[in-house]
């Protein structure tokens, strides 16, 4: 079953390489183990930035290795990904699946731009 | 054109095991994740265990975990769900499901195998 994700349309990640957004979903119902997975669009490609899954009212559990971290809040999701360079500059999409209790839900939103501009090295101060 | 073509089903007594495979044909395929999903008579679809190519990475609804293994052969394009301590309330008709990427949702179906467990 489908459900509308909704996020920004543009984010500029800060001079140390962080970009937050806000991915908000409209639950049909009441979930109560919801996953969360942020893919990344560039150049017609498609990978998987990190996923996380959390219990409604509980902090979500990324990977170990992951550069995402999020708190979620009611039918939102606060998401910062960390450590992001220039080259990494595309299109992040918010993918909201609503696992339990049945049915299952699945929604996409239509993507955040997230800029990043590598800040320009310190001169020499001779 | 994409099909999932699913078979193992049958019916068990319960504590039993069975082994589902889900096997893609048409074309070479690169899946981002290949999942099963189950629907009882009267009942809404259920989430059952997904596995994604990314890392490998498996997912599995609370009423499976432990009992249930998902696992996927890329070189054969299929997809297997091993079912182990099954129950009663295991029996549905399970389907299986694949994503070619993460931002396209479950793009192809099977038509799904019934799984009877009985007391």
């Known amino acids: 079953k489908a459900m509308h994700v909704a996020q920004p349309a543009v984010v500029l990640a800060s001079s140390r390489g962080i970009a937050s957004f806000v991915c908000e979903y409209a639950s049909p119902g009441k979930a109560t183990e919801v996953r969360v997975t942020v893919l990344r669009q560039a150049d017609s490609q498609v990978t998987e930035v990190c996923a996380a899954t959390y219990m409604m009212g509980n902090e979500l559990t990324f990977l170990d290795d992951s550069i995402c971290t999020g708190t979620s809040s009611g039918n939102q999701v606060n998401l910062t990904i960390q450590g992001l360079r220039a080259m990494d500059t595309g299109l992040y999409i918010c993918k909201v699946e609503l696992m339990y209790p049945p049915p299952y839900y699945l929604g996409i939103g239509n993507g955040t731009q997230i800029y990043v501009i590598d800040p320009e090295p310190c001169p020499d101060s001779d | 054109e994409v099909q999932l073509v699913e078979s193992g089903g049958g019916v068990v007594q319960a504590g039993g095991s069975l082994r589902l495979s889900c096997a893609a044909s048409?074309?070479?395929?690169?899946?981002?994740?290949m999942g099963w999903f189950r629907q009882a008579p009267g009942k809404e679809q259920e989430f059952v265990a997904d596995?994604?190519?990314?890392?490998?990475?498996?997912y599995y609804a609370d009423s499976v975990k432990g009992r249930f293994t998902i696992s996927r052969d890329n070189a054969k394009n299929t997809v297997y769900l091993q079912m182990n301590s099954l129950k009663p309330e295991d029996t549905a008709v399970y389907y299986c499901?694949?994503?070619?990427?993460?931002?396209?949702?479950?793009?192809?179906w099977g038509q799904g195998t019934q799984v009877q467990v009985s007391s």
């Open positions: 499901a694949a994503e070619m990427s993460g931002i396209s949702g479950w793009d192809y």
């Open positions: 048409g074309g070479t395929f690169s899946f981002y994740g």
């Open positions: 596995i994604r190519t990314s890392a490998g990475r498996t």
